[in-house]
């Protein structure tokens, strides 16, 4: 995805000294935390696959790109990156695959330049509603985040809290309207069964939305109308059966949109007629000639673009008196 990358050619590994436990203590100019690699030229710090259990306290103030991937952080507390002086340059933070199961309110506070955040591949059983907004005010200070990567953050079923995972994630996205400037949101591979209806309306700046490899069956209650800047919508590898007229019209009305619909088990019956008509006319669907019917059996493997209304029938529903057991 959009992980922060580095052109760092020379990294200085830290000398094995004791990291200061006092985050308020100003770091030395060229200091590099134990178990990390640093490149001041590339403004990059990499603490990768080191089984760290907490965020290093002595991060250099110059850091712009911070990789903390492949660790064992477990919990990200409030102010996990708050330092004196603050990490004012930190723009890209990658925490993927670090066994985080809890991100607390205000975890990313005091990072005024943070534009890219990747929390992918962490089993987030407890994501605070105020993880990104920092406060429980009804309207928070705007977050600087432009890209938020949350792919595969669903915990195993036995570790989930007794609540909707979709609801928990959406609460964090919407709290305090802090993410109004978000342009890229990736939520792939999270077993989402539905998309709460209010989520997209409150993220008006979105350019790229990735919902691929979830279990979305329908978009009936999802509105794309406000997303006038949306450029790519990834819906591949879901459980979509058909897109209805309202959704089709909204997508067609978005001026820059490209939609990706591969690998959905389309049901080619009478309810598919509008979508087929739309597909034949629209230019917004990428690889539209790859879309094929999965059901019913007599229609299996047929290319949607080659269907006509005569092909699309529904078996009549028999009145109860005529039904056989």
């Amino acid at each position: 995805s959009s992980s922060p990358t580095s052109s760092a050619s020379s990294f200085s590994s830290s000398a094995p000294f004791l990291a200061s436990a006092v985050s308020a203590q100003p770091p030395l100019p060229d200091q590099c935390p134990a178990l990390c690699e640093c490149s001041e030229a590339a403004r990059t710090v990499k603490c990768v696959n080191r089984n760290l259990t907490e965020v290093p306290t002595d991060l250099p103030a110059y850091v712009r790109n911070l990789f903390l991937t492949g660790n064992q952080l477990a919990v990200l507390p409030a102010g996990a990156f708050a330092r004196r002086p603050p990490l004012a340059e930190l723009a890209a933070l990658n925490l993927s695959g670090s066994r985080l199961d809890e991100v607390r309110a205000g975890a990313f506070e005091h990072l005024p330049s943070l534009r890219q955040l990747d929390l992918s591949h962490n089993p987030l059983a407890d994501l605070s509603p105020f993880a990104f907004s920092g406060s429980n005010a009804s309207v928070s200070a705007p977050s600087p985040l432009v890209e938020l990567i949350l792919n595969h953050i669903v915990p195993p079923e036995d570790e989930r809290q007794n609540r909707s995972f979709e609801g928990m994630v959406v609460a964090a996205l919407l709290a305090g309207r802090a993410l109004q400037g978000l342009r890229r949101l990736e939520l792939a591979s999270n077993h989402f069964l539905y998309l709460p209806r209010d989520v997209l309306a409150q993220l008006p700046s979105l350019r790229h939305l990735d919902l691929s490899n979830n279990s979305l069956v329908s978009l009936t209650y999802v509105s794309f109308r406000n997303l006038t800047h949306l450029e790519s919508l990834h819906l591949e590898d879901n459980a979509l059966k058909v897109l209805h007229n309202g959704t089709l019209a909204e997508l067609q009305g978005l001026p820059h949109i490209r939609v990706f619909l591969d690998n959905n088990p389309w049901v080619c019956d009478c309810h598919m007629a509008d979508m087929v008509t739309w597909l034949k006319e629209t230019e917004v669907v990428q690889g539209k000639d790859r879309l094929t019917c999965a059901y019913p059996e007599k229609m299996r493997n047929r290319v949607l673009l080659e269907l006509n209304s005569a092909d699309l029938d529904c078996d009549p529903i028999l009145p109860p008196s005529l039904q056989t057991s």
Epitope: N263, R302, V303
Partner: antibody, heavy 116, light 107 residues
Framework: QVQLQQPGTELVKPGASVKLSCKAS????????MHWVKQRPEQGLEWIGN????????NYNEKFKNKATLTVDKSSSTAYMQLSSLTFEDSAVYYC?????????WGQGTTLTVSS | QVVLTQSPAIMSASPGEKVTMTCSAS?????MHWYQQRSGTSPKRWIY???KLTSGVPARFSGSGSGTSYSLTISSMEAEDAATYYC??????????FGGGTKLEIR
């Protein structure tokens, strides 16, 4: 009953090219993608690529991009696969198969022998 | 790209015996298909969408699984079941991937 007819055998020399055919009948040819699959003796199945007969769009397995070229003739409901610069490793059975999610009908296969 | 690994590569069973073969995916997939190929013939789609039998396939065959682990089971082996069985990834976009096959012989 859907049928995909393929010639039984082709014998060609190394370095030459060959064009294998697959004639479809008893279904609407343009409504389904056509796939090609390779099987070497005593080996497994290897997907080569597919073609949409309606518009000629193709997809290829990276491994076969410089080896296979897929085309169709809609008027005769026939799919073709040209294999170029043949080597002994290209000796195999080549199947055409109708498909989308899966391959629901297969041809009988053409046994290609590359021999000097 | 998802890799499919079938096991065992070769197995034998006596008539009437229960047979189970597996197909393991390198990452989670939604469904799996199975093909039967008898010696000297082309493959036939046998089971699709993990558990649905193609028309004409005997009811002694069944398929199951989810995520990365799938299996094909024959409740009572018959001589005509001797064949090679291939699993294939559920997808409608390239590439289409097959497992290496399980060769089932009659004992």
């Amino acid at each position: 009953q859907v049928q995909l007819q393929q010639p039984g055998t082709e014998l060609v020399k190394p370095g030459a090219s060959v064009k294998l055919s697959c004639k479809a009948s008893d279904y609407t040819f343009t409504s389904y993608w056509m796939h090609w699959v390779k099987q070497r003796p005593e080996q497994g199945l290897e997907w080569i690529g597919n073609i949409n007969p309606s518009n000629g769009n193709t997809n290829y397995n990276e491994k076969f991009k410089n080896k296979a070229t897929l085309t169709v003739d809609k008027s005769s409901s026939t799919a073709y696969m040209q294999l170029s610069s043949l080597t002994f490793e290209d000796s195999a059975v080549y199947y055409c198969a109708r498909g989308g999610w899966d391959f629901d009908y297969w041809g009988q296969g053409t046994t290609l022998t590359v021999s000097s | 790209q998802v890799v499919l690994t079938q096991s065992p590569a070769i197995m034998s069973a006596s008539p009437g015996e229960k047979v189970t073969m597996t197909c393991s995916a390198s990452s989670s997939v939604r469904y799996m298909h199975w093909y039967q190929q008898r010696s000297g013939t082309s493959p036939k789609r046998w089971i699709y969408d993990t558990s649905k039998l193609t028309s004409g396939v005997p009811a002694r065959f069944s398929g199951s699984g989810s995520g990365t682990s799938y299996s094909l089971t024959i409740s009572s082996m018959e001589a005509e079941d001797a064949a090679t069985y291939y699993c294939q990834l559920w997808t409608s976009k390239p590439p289409w991937t097959f497992g290496g096959g399980t060769k089932l012989e009659i004992r």
